[in-house]
Each structure stands twice: as structure tokens, then as C-alpha cells.
């Protein structure tokens, strides 16, 4: 059925009306408009746009706009004891120290409150000692210097550079190294795209450039006082020692100049392959220690920044649905930013006003969706996803008996060469058959498909003539939603033709040279790319909130659980010999799957054949479309990670950003080969088996006929 | 880490026949796909035939449909290829892959680490 059908609406107000009602010239206004001044968390000017987005939205025509607001712990610097590093002689003079702030660009010279680079919660302290080089930081980084290498981090400064994972899971790394301090720098090898010129002529990260971000190991949890439940006024909140997911050592950004003075002296041992060196002309060295000449010198970090229980605000529009008021749909992206936000958030928070413009203006004209519409601008999303965590935590009950489906809205570009979509297997359909209606923004495909343009330069590694559509995984404002309450979720925006650097970012990502000119001169002059992801968040909004059985294919579903436990067998079965002395089967898992397979296959026929007429039938099966994400939720969640409660689902334990299929099963099997009680190791296998096949089995059950 | 092995290759006349085997010692039980592959000089890569090794299905590439059979014998862990009826132009090297999977009718795409392949064996026949 078309969406125009859902409602009693003339033909006008369809899918095509919202869509052309779209507009590039406003995308880009209110991009202007929202990049002007820095919208910390926590701060005045912060709460000033809360308001401005909460008026405007009302003016758009929403039911209703509401400021939610908790108090949450945040992280600033110390603005009278700056943070910085230096290099120490055998006297303890400071012989070099690094920068205290970015150059501003042009423009912004007299912009006041851009706070300086800072590794947000980073604990105080002035560790000094030797240096040692330990690459990205990632889990098989430490795995090769402490295994291979025999090189011990034990009371070591240890500095990384940025990019393939999650920054907190290098911090939290280096801590269980022994590391008692952690630069942090972004390596031009990463961060500088050959041929391309250094902002202000062009996209690339300048010398002087840092990403700032915070250093959390949170796995879900939302404020780190008040794990679990929204931190409200009358919140008990727990002593700073027992807060979720702090840094218990000193950390700190820098950019590549400063961090060449740091590697061009390190001595001890040569990287020990070429994937270990950058682009900066230094040896790589890895260390221990500067090198002869200088092997007297140490590093000396100076960190006084402070946490602070602070309030922030969401924004919580409502278009009240008309058929079903009580299912949900909800679009949120977030609204506070390091610095500008040039591109994080507000190319995301710009399109979302947009699409909140266009349903008004739809609405202003007597239409009204079949569901309810929730629009949200989150706050402290760069603090670790706290305002989208705490209202989650304060609605839980609502959403996830009336959750349908959230749609991410953050940074609308990361590049310009394609299209990028990460969500639940539940919305494959959805995305294929809305790409195919809408047309591609991209030079060379005139006239043709967003889908063709997409499919073309992002080809499915497994499915020919299909696109590329990859696992959530975490890292921002859908992950509550999706990770603890098995809410459907998708994300969608304009990427780079950069696969290697895929958790990387963008080169001035989290810099203060993240403005509206970076987006408006170098990479969407005429906001055709933003159009484009505006159109495909909106339009999947439309369709989840307007169609009259949702648009929800739950084959999909078993097409990658069928991949999934191919994948974690083939894992396990690298243990033959294990296997077989602890009688580890997966037998239970195929049979699940099996299950899984031709249960929703029938319920696919079913959905074809039934009376759409009859409203009881109708809402029976869309519940049972509803719950399919929520049947995958095991209430008592991941070992060690409550919050992370997905059975098929979570964040890798490796890396935040990237998606992990049974994740259970997977952190089990890792490193196994080392575990001091290989007994008790591949116990732990043959449980997450058991979850897991439970799981799939139990989530099949809920699609079979109800009685 | 499992090694394949594989063996059976050899010179034969055109009309003759090789039995080829690939053995994944270790394998503890039926559930992988098990292929044959060849690679013929200045030519690419291409499959021949495969095993679900769980379900017994087989399949087989349109070059060799007819003349080849591939078996199993799962107690061993072992999977063969008949090959006869032999033509010059099945002259390669023959390589042996295997996928611990249950599901799959082919070797997993876009998943490389998954998939171990064995040294390859020579099959040379001539006219």
C-alpha cells in the first residue's frame, strides 16, 4: 500500500509532498544560523539554541515542544590552569611545551568560550616519565608490544595516535597496560588526505589542529552518576569513585606539530612493521625513552581539568499521530558541539529542522501521520550520548511499549562520495525501496537512482546489484534506544570513498576548523548532499510513521543470522581440538536459526494474504513487527555490560564505533588461546551459545501464529 | 591453526580419470562447506565444485558438470573429486577450500578470514 492510504488524506499529502518540500536553501540557513558560536554542553549559549529550536519548531506547527533537562556529570578545563605537555631536562625545566589552543580560523579571532583541546574526564594529574609509541592503541597493538615485542608500558606515557577505534577504548587500553598517562595525536597519515590543502584553503587538518572528544568507557550507561536511571531532581547520585566509566589516568590531545617534537627523539625499538609508522618525518621508534642524546629527557603531562554536575536540555517535539497516537517513530540527532559543529552536529541538527519544517507545513494543511512523530535535539551527545541516555532511561516504560522505530540525525556528511547506511536488518527493505524513488545527487549520475549511484560505488560485499548496508554499532544518539531497548534503528549520511579510515572521521572532525565555511566552500557548496541524506531520514521517518503495516521485512532478519553463526562457528572452529575436548556444539544455534528462517517466512506470507481492513488483525501484526528488535534483548544483557542488552548486537568490546555480531559469543571466543582456565573459557562458549540460540528462538516464537 | 591438506594430482592421458582428495585434520564435526578450485596458467582463479559437508548439498560448475563428482567421507574429514572423462583444458593447479559454516551454498563472500585454502595439487592432462 502507498503511505498516502494511511490516513484520510487527499493524494497531495503523500510521501512526494513531504519530500518536495525539502528545500537545500534552508538546510543551508539554518546551518548558518547554528554554527555561529560555539554550543557546548553545559553551557549559557548552549541552552539559548535549546530554546530557539524549542520556538521554532513550534512555529513549524509540532503539537507540542518541550525542554527535558537533567543533571549529568560533564568535563571542563580548568580556565585559569591551562592543560599541556612538556618535554623535561634532567633539571625539570620545561624545554618544550605544547600549544594551549588552536589558531582560531579566519573570521573567528574574536569568538569568545571555544574551549581549548581537552580529552573530556580526563582525571587530574602531572605524570612524567618515558615515552613509548604504541601506534593506534588498539587491543592487537598492545597484543604486539607486550607478546612480541616484550615491551612493558608499566608506568610509561604512553602516546597513540587517533583513528581506527573508539578513543576510550585506546585510554582504557593503555590503563590496563599499566600506562600512567596518554597523549593522544592525529597522525597526517590519517588525518591529511593527499593533495588536498590544509584549512583555510582546503579540508585537511592543519599542523596546529586537535580533536577533542571524551575518553569514557560507559558501554551504555549514560551518566556515569546515575547509572540506569535519568538524573533528575530528586536522583541519588554515586561518589566520584564509583562513577561508570571514568579514566583513571591523565589523558591528553595534541595536534601533528606538537606531537612531531615528541616522536622525532624516541629511541629503544624500530616499529616493528610498516603499518606502525605515520606520515610525520620521525623514526616511529616505539621505545621505551628518547633516544642517546636525549635519553635524560622525559615527558611531563599537566592535566587540571575538573568534572562537574551540570544541567543540559533536550528538545522534544510531537506530531501526535492520528490512526495509532500511542506508536512512536522517533528522529533525534543532537544538538551540542566541541566547538562550531560545522559539520558535528549541526549538518545532522540543520536537516532534522528541515524535515521538522516540512511535516508542519504538511500538517498547517490538514495532514496528520498515521503514528506519532517524536523529534528530539539530544544534548551532552559529546559527553558520552548523556541526553539521549537520561531520556530514555526517564521514558523506558513509554518506549518500549510503543517504540516503533528511531532514526539517528547526526553529522549529515563525513565526505562527499556516497551514501552510508548502518541499521537493523528490519529496515533493508525500507532503505532499498526508498533510494530506488530518489535521485542521485552524485556528478555522472544524472537522472539515474540514489540506489544506482550508491549500490555502484558501495557495492554489498556479499549480494551483487545490492549496496553496502553495515551493522550499528555505537558512538552515538541510538544507541540507548537500540542497544538496551531493542528499539529498530537506522542511520544514514554522505561518506568519503575512504573504507580504510572508516572509524577515523573526517580530517577536521572535532577541531575548532569544523565551521559552516569547511561544509559551504569544500565539501556541499550547493547542500545537494545534504538534500539528499535530508530526503532519505525524512523520507524513512514518513514511511515508518505513515505506512499502514510497517515497513518492516523480517526475512532480512534471518539472512544475517544465518551469516552471523557461519561467522562465529567458523571463530570457534579455529579451536578444533578445544571443541572437541569440551564437547562445544553449535547445533543449537543452527537449529535456532533454522527455526528462525522459515517461521518468518511464513509470517512474510501471512503479512501478504491478511485482511488489512479489519484494525485488530492489522495492529496485531504490525506488534508482532513491532517486538521482533525487542525479542532480541536479553533482560539480564552482555557479561560485564548491562546496558548492551542486544543479543545479536552490541558495540565491539574493541572498538565502540564498530558493530559486533553475537557479541556474546564473540568476547568469549577471544583470545581464548590465552586464558588461564581453558576449562572455564570454553564454559563460558557453550553458555553465550545457549543464550543465543534461546534468544533467536524465542524471537522466532513471537512471530509464529498467536493462537 | 588447521592446515589443509590435499592430494591425487598427476599427469593422465585425455579420457582419463584423478580422484583428488583435501583432508581438514581437526575438524570436529560435518559442518563446513568444502570446495575445489583450479587455476590454469595465465588464467584466473575459478570454481569448480562444492560440498556442504552438514547437508550433503553439492554443486558444481558448468565446465565439469557430468564428468566430475564430489563425495565426502565425514568420519575423516575428508571430501574427493572424481574427476573424469579428463580434456586438456582441465590442466591446472587444483586447490582445496574450506568454510566452517552451516548455512552457506558457497564460500562466504566479503569474509576472506574465514576461509583457509590448502597448497594446491598439479593435474596435467594431456592430448
Known amino acids: 500500500k502507498s503511505s498516502n492510504e494511511a490516513t484520510n488524506i487527499t493524494p497531495k499529502h503523500n510521501m512526494k509532498a513531504f519530500l518536495d518540500e525539502l528545500k537545500a536553501e534552508n538546510i543551508k540557513k539554518f546551518l548558518y544560523n547554528f554554527t555561529q558560536i560555539p554550543h557546548l554542553a553545559g553551557t549559557e549559549q548552549n541552552f539559548q539554541l535549546a530554546k530557539q529550536i524549542q520556538s521554532q519548531w513550534k512555529e513549524f506547527g509540532l503539537d507540542s515542544v518541550e525542554l527535558a533537562h537533567y543533571d549529568v556529570l560533564l568535563s571542563y578545563p580548568n580556565k585559569t590552569h591551562p592543560n599541556y605537555i612538556s618535554i623535561i631536562n634532567e633539571d625539570g625545566n620545561e624545554i618544550f611545551n605544547t600549544s594551549l589552543f588552536e589558531p582560531p580560523p579566519p573570521g573567528y579571532e574574536n569568538v569568545s568560550d571555544i574551549v581549548p583541546p581537552f580529552s573530556a574526564f580526563s582525571p587530574q594529574g602531572m605524570p612524567e616519565g618515558d615515552l613509548v609509541y604504541v601506534n593506534y592503541a588498539r587491543t592487537e597493538d598492545f597484543f604486539k608490544l607486550e607478546r612480541d615485542m616484550k615491551i612493558n608500558c608499566s608506568g610509561k606515557i604512553v602516546i597513540a595516535r587517533y583513528g581506527k577505534v573508539f578513543r576510550g577504548n585506546k585510554v582504557k587500553n593503555a590503563q590496563l597496560a599499566g600506562a600512567k598517562g596518554v597523549i593522544l595525536y592525529s597522525d597526517p597519515a590519517d588525518y591529511f588526505a593527499p593533495g588536498v590543502k590544509s584549512y583555510p584553503d582546503g579540508w585537511n587538518l592543519p599542523g596546529g589542529g586537535v580533536q577533542r572528544g571524551n575518553i569514557l568507557n560507559l558501554n551504555g550507561a549514560g551518566d556515569p552518576l546515575t547509572p540506569g536511571y535519568p538524573a533528575n531532581e530528586y536522583a541519588y547520585r554515586r561518589g566520584i569513585a564509583e562513577a561508570v566509566g571514568l579514566p583513571s589516568i591523565p589523558v591528553h590531545p595534541i595536534g601533528y606539530y606538537d606531537a612531531q617534537k615528541l616522536l622525532e627523539k624516541m629511541g629503544g625499538s624500530a616499529p616493528p612493521d610498516s603499518s606502525w609508522r605515520g606520515s610525520l618525518k620521525v623514526p616511529y621508534n616505539v621505545g621505551p625513552g628518547f633516544t642517546g642524546n636525549f635519553s635524560t629527557q622525559k615527558v611531563k603531562m599537566h592535566i587540571h581539568s575538573t568534572n562537574e554536575v551540570t544541567r543540559i536540555y533536550n528538545v522534544i517535539g510531537t506530531l501526535r499521530g492520528a490512526v495509532e497516537p500511542d506508536r512512536y517513530v522517533i528522529l533525534g540527532g543532537h544538538r551540542d558541539s566541541w566547538v562550531f559543529g560545522g559539520i558535528d552536529p549541526q549538518s545532522g541538527a540543520a536537516v532534522v529542522h528541515e524535515i521538522v519544517r516540512s511535516f508542519g507545513t504538511l500538517k498547517k494543511e490538514g495532514w496528520r501521520p498515521r503514528r506519532t512523530i517524536l523529534f528530539a535535539s539530544w544534548d551532552a551527545e559529546e559527553f558520552g550520548l548523556l541526553g539521549s541516555t537520561e531520556w530514555a532511561e526517564e521514558n523506558s516504560r513509554l518506549l518500549q511499549e510503543r517504540g516503533v522505530a528511531y532514526i539517528n540525525a547526526d553529522s549529515s556528511i563525513e565526505g562527499n562520495y556516497t551514501l552510508r547506511v548502518d541499521c537493523t536488518p528490519l529496515m533493508y527493505s525500507l532503505v532499498h525501496n526508498l533510494t530506488k524513488e530518489l535521485k542521485s545527487p552524485d556528478e555522472g549520475f544524472e537522472g539515474k537512482s540514489l540506489y544506482e549511484s550508491w549500490t555502484k560505488k558501495s557495492p554489498s560485499p556479499e549480494f551483487s546489484g545490492m549496496p553496502r548496508i553495515s551493522k550499528l554499532g555505537s558512538g552515538n544518539d541510538f544507541e540507548v534506544f537500540f542497544q538496551r531497548l531493542g528499539i529498530a534503528s537506522g542511520r544514514a549520511r554522505y561518506t568519503k570513498n575512504w573504507e580504510t579510515n572508516k572509524f577515523s572521521g573526517y580530517p577536521l572532525y572535532h577541531s575548532v576548523y569544523e565551521t559552516y565555511e569547511l561544509v559551504e566552500k569544500f565539501y556541499d557548496p550547493m547542500f545537494k548532499y545534504h538534500l539528499t541524506v535530508a530526503q532519505v531520514r525524512g523520507g524513512m521517518v514518513f514511511e515508518l510513521a505513515n505506512s499502514i503495516v510497517l515497513p518492516f521485512d523480517c526475512r532480512d532478519y534471518a539472512v544475517v543470522l544465518r551469516k552471523y553463526a557461519d561467522k562465529i562457528y567458523s571463530i570457534s572452529m579455529k579451536h578444533p581440538q578445544e571443541m572437541k575436548t569440551y564437547s562445544v556444539s553449535f547445533d543449537s544455534l543452527f537449529s535456532a536459526v533454522k527455526n528462525f528462517t522459515e517461521i518468518a517466512s511464513k509470517f512474510s506470507e501471512r503479512l501478504q494474504d491478511f485482511d488489512k481492513s479489519n484494525p485488530i488483525v492489522l495492529r496485531m501484526m504490525n506488534d508482532q513487527l513491532m517486538f521482533l528488535e525487542r525479542a532480541f534483548i536479553d533482560p539480564l544483557g552482555l557479561p560485564d555490560r548491562p546496558f548492551y542488552r542486544h543479543v545479536i548486537y552490541a558495540p565491539s568490546s574493541h572498538n565502540k564505533y564498530a558493530g559486533e555480531s553475537f557479541p556474546g559469543i564473540y568476547d568469549a571466543l577471544f583470545d581464548i588461546e590465552s586464558k588461564v582456565d581453558p576449562s572455564k573459557a570454553w564454559g563460558e562458549v557453550k553458555r553465550q551459545i545457549y543464550v543465543a540460540a534461546f534468544t533467536v528462538q524465542a524471537a522466532a516464537e513471537t512471530l509464529s501464529e498467536v493462537a | 591453526q588447521v592446515q589443509l591438506q590435499e592430494s591425487g594430482g598427476g599427469s593422465v592421458q585425455a579420457g582419463g580419470s584423478l580422484r583428488l582428495s583435501c583432508t581438514a585434520p581437526g575438524y570436529t564435526d560435518s559442518n563446513y562447506y568444502m570446495s575445489w578450485f583450479r587455476q590454469a596458467p595465465g588464467k584466473e582463479r575459478e570454481w569448480v565444485a562444492g560440498?556442504?559437508?552438514?547437508?550433503?548439498?553439492?554443486s558444481y560448475a558448468d565446465t565439469v558438470k557430468g564428468r566430475f563428482t564430489i563425495s565426502q567421507d565425514n568420519a575423516k574429514n575428508t571430501m574427493f573429486l572424481q574427476m573424469n572423462s579428463l580434456k586438456p583444458e582441465d590442466t591446472a593447479i587444483y586447490y582445496c577450500a574450506v568454510a566452517a559454516c552451516h548455512f552457506c551454498d558457497s564460500l562466504p563472500k566479503g569474509q576472506d578470514e574465514q576461509i583457509l585454502w590448502g597448497q594446491g595439487t598439479q593435474v596435467t592432462v594431456s592430448s
Open positions: 560440498v556442504n559437508t552438514g547437508r550433503g548439498s553439492t
